[in-house]
Amino acid sequence: MAVTACQGLGFVVSLIGIAGIIAATCMDQWSTQDLYNNPVTAVFNYQGLWRSCVRESSGFTECRGYFTLLGLPAMLQAVRALMIVGIVLGAIGLLVSIFALKCIRIGSMEDSAKANMTLTSGIMFIVSGLCAIAGVSVFANMLVTNFWMSTANMYTGMGGMVQTVQTRYTFGAALFVGWVAGGLTLIGGVMMCIACRGLAPEETNYKAVSYHASGHSVAYKPGGFKASTGFGSNTKNKKIYDGGARTEDEVQSYPSKHDYV
């Protein structure tokens, strides 16, 4: 029962997380105009991964897409790629995990197959979450760098007479949505991996071992120990795995180098 609950909860949490990653990717407010120096602006600027927008106090909002591909900063392209990879992996993970759910019966699918699918989807969710967190973090880092660069030369003037305030950008709502969504997807993935351990109908047979103590001839012979977890599993379909407990696959993320433009 606990395994089913863990798997189900992992699926739901990942589903919410991936929906959040999709929402964050589509959102226009990745960076918003910093109003610290001009809190009473009649024009508010904000930017997303795909377009930049200007909202006037009149209520009129104008958005312009980034129609160029080569002219965009490499960092922005990298963030787009990370978010899309996260969405794709998450979507595939969701598809796999639906068939892996213990509450759904598909023909005579064995528990071992469901366990493998649960593990696969779990890993996909973990990588998906990491991609989203990495993407959002890269963008946030880019914002922080640009923020302090623009602060350094905030005011440029003609003989000190005319002020030209450079527009600075700060964290937008999409960043927080992305971080939370990435975190949820990651947690969901971990839960799926935990559920996989319970789903696997492991039956480990320990071979009889004789221990010969000096001066004594006492043999310790433990019987075949059956480790079986998983509620309501069909024992006649169980396969016996020899050679100890299985470990979860490790997710390795390879750092990639992107240049600022």
């Epitope: 009649a42 024009v43 009149s58």
Partner: antibody
Framework: DVQLVESGGGLVQPGGSRKLSCAAS????????MHWVRQAPEKGLEWVAY????????YYADTVKGRFTLSRDNPKNTLFLQMTSLRSEDTAIYYC????????????WGQGTSVTVSS | DVVLTQSPSSLTVTEGEKVSMSCKSS????????????LTWYQQKPGQTPTLLIY???TRKSGVPDRFTGSGSGTDFTLTINTVQAEDLAVYYC?????????FGAGTKLDLK
């Protein structure tokens, strides 16, 4: 057709109060920011105050801050300007205008209501 | 606050003449987000309410004759009337619509000889 009709003007004693109204029609009042602009006799235009569509943002000119209060009643399509502690320099024609157009431009203006502050 | 300085304060021209008036801002009215200047020009004929002529510093409002041209960027703006007509007798105001308070210039009065 967009129409803005101001009312509530008249003669007021210094230190007195007055409430101006602006009835709007011909457009979705609740979707647009509204402004008050005044013009003293033989003088130029002076922006007075602004209120956003949902009353979330309200801004005032420094000359009226703390004395004037701007509000709106969206269901009744009406804009209000409550003026207190009136001074002789507040004597002007008060126009209500809307940022109906692009670029925060004040496209539609009312005919104005005259406020005279005098003893 | 943004201070707008209009010059000259008054102009006397003959019909058919080309006229230009200036509006200088104490701060830049250029918005990098959409590459637009948030300066508006209004016309106020004697005894009438102001009417919008130009927004975004150079975009004519529909219905405004093409003899009216707005130009400039950042802090320096100009309103040009190519062939002045009798009906153009009015006071012309520029307005900062970039940050609150939305200040107006003192105006340029256009008179005909």
């Amino acid at each position: 057709d967009v129409q803005l009709v101001e009312s509530g003007g008249g003669l007021v004693q210094p230190g007195g109060s007055r409430k101006l109204s602006c009835a709007a029609s011909g457009f979705t009042f609740s979707s647009f920011g509204m402004h008050w602009v005044r013009q003293a006799p033989e003088k130029g235009l002076e922006w007075v105050a602004y209120i956003s569509s949902g009353s979330g943002s309200i801004y005032y000119a420094d000359t009226v801050k703390g004395r004037f209060t701007l509000s709106r009643d969206n269901p009744k399509n009406t804009l209000f300007l409550q003026m207190t502690s009136l001074r002789s320099e507040d004597t002007a024609i008060y126009y209500c205008a809307t940022s109906y157009y692009y670029g925060n431009a004040l496209e539609y203006w009312g005919q104005g209501t005259s406020v005279t502050v005098s003893s | 606050d943004v201070v707008l300085t209009q010059s000259p304060s008054s102009l006397t021209v003959t019909e058919g003449e080309k006229v230009s008036m200036s509006c200088k801002s104490s701060q830049s009215l250029f918005n990098s987000g959409n590459q637009k200047n948030y300066l508006t020009w209004y016309q106020q004929k004697p005894g009438q309410t102001p009417t919008l002529l130009i927004y975004w510093a150079s975009t004519r409002k529909s219905g405004v004759p093409d003899r009216f041209t707005g130009s400039g960027s950042g802090t320096d703006f100009t309103l040009t009337i190519n062939t002045v007509q009798a009906e153009d007798l009015a006071v012309y105001y520029c307005q900062n619509v970039y940050s609150y308070p939305l200040t107006f210039g003192a105006g340029t009065k256009l008179d005909l000889k």
